[in-house]
């Protein structure tokens, strides 16, 4: 993989420790928390990033209506278990032996249980809806300009193949970005939509994961786009399994 050879850093992940101890003295970077080697030419998996974050010291168009099965990450931060490829393990447990099943983006998709809970497979999140609300601007954004700018962003900054940006919807002041990626569509080397969405979310929050970058500030044809709030909905290939108690809460 490529890390900046001169000063040996990881351009795509600041939550790493890098040293020239790779083959032939090449720069090798390992994720904080897990110590796993990361590929600095692409995005690091969300599981490794969450683990690193937990180890770090504290510091006219109709919009899409999320389906009834859409998940929102309400549980927040936890220290996840990652598999050898850096993916989330299907079952996650905390220190008090409370366990739950997660999807491929690490969001809980079942009720919490005990150590006897079984999660047979890691269910893939194949559809992500990023819902943004922007602050007042000089005027409404031109939809095609906004669409082009957001597609460019996901292609250039997050290295996500354009075919995975399914749509950009706009009804001032709401912007929705739809990412879709089925298991069958994702080829080796393709950035995962869950990882791209996580990098985007952190960028919007002013917590860029890229080395030496501040937060992401978007502009469309020169016009500053100041985001007021962000909501991300996750849709899995298999609907989540929650008890009726949760659904009626």
């Amino acid at each position: 993989h490529t890390a900046a050879q001169d000063n040996c850093t990881c351009p795509t992940n600041k939550m790493t420790v890098c040293s020239p101890d790779g083959p032939g003295g090449r720069c090798q970077c390992r994720a904080l928390g897990s110590g796993m080697a990361v590929d600095c030419s692409t995005l690091t998996s969300k599981c490794l990033l969450l683990k690193a974050r937990m180890s770090a010291p504290k510091n006219a168009r109709t919009l899409v209506r999320p389906s009834e099965h859409a998940l929102v990450d309400n549980d927040g931060l936890y220290d996840p278990d990652c598999d050898p490829e850096g993916r989330f393990k299907a079952r996650q447990c905390n220190q008090t032996s409370v366990c739950w099943c997660v999807n491929s983006v690490g969001v809980r998709r079942t009720d919490k249980g005990d150590l006897s809970l079984r999660c047979d497979e890691l269910v893939r999140t194949h559809h992500i809806l990023i819902d943004l609300r922007h602050r007042p601007t000089a005027g409404a954004f031109n939809h095609s300009d906004l669409d082009a700018e957001l597609r460019r962003l996901f292609r250039e900054r997050y290295r996500l193949h354009p075919k995975f940006v399914a749509a950009v919807h706009y009804e001032q002041p709401t912007i929705q970005i739809e990412l879709r990626q089925n298991t069958s569509q994702k080829a080796a080397g393709d950035v995962d939509i869950g990882d791209a969405a996580y990098y985007f979310e952190r960028d919007i929050k002013g917590e860029s994961l890229f080395q030496g970058r501040g937060g992401l500030d978007l502009r469309v044809r020169g016009e500053p786009l100041q985001v007021e709030r962000t909501l991300i909905y996750y849709l899995d290939e298999i609907p989540p399994k929650f008890s009726m108690k949760r659904l009626t809460a």
């Epitope: 602050r135 601007t137 000089a138 005027g139 919007i204 929050k205 002013g206 917590e207 860029s208 970058r213 501040g214 937060g215 500030d217 502009r219 044809r221 020169g222 016009e223 500053p224 100041q226 007021e228």
Partner: antibody, heavy 119, light 106 residues
Framework: QVQLVQSGAEVKKPGASVKMSCKAS????????IHWVRQAPGQRLEWIGY????????KYNEKFKGRATLTSDKSASTAYMELSSLRSEDTAVYYC????????????WGQGTLVTVSS | DIQMTQSPSSLSASVGDRVTITCKAS??????LAWYQQKPGKAPKLLLY???SLETGVPSRFSGSGSGTDYTLTISSLQPEDFATYYC????????FGQGTKVEIK
């Protein structure tokens, strides 16, 4: 290199209007908005508003709505600010500024136009 | 509007001193914070953006930290050319500046 060159100092009477200019060079004028910021003697910097030369769209600080008018001339790569109904507290240095290429912070600034309002 | 409160409003220091200026926002600004240096009769100069990112050409003795509502500008070893007024600015919701901190020679 990027440059913002502002018009010269002005002395005005209360109730009058003043119009100042900001000529941009060294970059594509329509790529960025132009902000206007003022600084009264011994006071903090105060954002007035911005104009997007692409479409002449404007956004103002509520405090200046109705009194400040921002315009631009693409062919001359120049932005203008007019402030009407001047009062003594409008005595200040008025700056134009361009955003940073990566963020909404202000990277390049004009040298400032001093406006003195006095009877 | 988001209010920005800087402290102290002025400080006296000597060459070589470590100087810290703080800026508090009235609400979370998600690291959309810039620091500027201004010398008398001159326009402000951008030092840092995104709370921690150093603008090109700015000496590494300047650094920024913070998150949420609380941010800090640190000059690790004050140089003669650093005596000036420093302003913080938020750009999360429109643009507002702090009242400034004047760094004077002791």
């Amino acid at each position: 290199q990027v440059q913002l060159v502002q018009s010269g100092a002005e002395v005005k009477k209360p109730g009058a209007s003043v119009k100042m200019s900001c000529k941009a060079s060294g970059y594509t004028f329509t790529t960025y908005v132009i902000h206007w910021v003022r600084q009264a003697p011994g006071q903090r910097l105060e954002w007035i508003g911005y104009i997007n030369p692409n479409n002449d769209g404007t956004k103002y600080n509520e405090k200046f709505k109705g009194r400040a008018t921002l315009t631009s001339d693409k062919s001359a790569s120049t932005a203008y600010m007019e402030l009407s109904s001047l009062r003594s507290e409008d005595t200040a240095v008025y700056y134009c500024a361009r955003p940073h290429f990566e963020t909404h912070a202000m990277d390049y600034w004009g040298q400032g136009t001093l406006v003195t309002v006095s009877s | 509007d988001i209010q920005m409160t800087q402290s102290p409003s002025s400080l006296s220091a000597s060459v070589g001193d470590r100087v810290t200026i703080t800026c508090k926002a009235s609400e979370d600004i998600f690291n959309r914070l810039a620091w500027y240096q201004q010398k008398p009769g001159k326009a402000p100069k951008l030092l840092l953006y995104g709370a921690t990112s150093l603008e090109t050409g700015v000496p590494s003795r300047f650094s920024g930290s913070g998150s949420g509502t609380d941010y800090t500008l640190t000059i690790s070893s004050l140089q003669p050319e650093d005596f000036a007024t420093y302003y913080c600015q938020q750009y999360w919701n429109t643009w507002t500046f702090g009242q400034g901190t004047k760094v004077e020679i002791k």
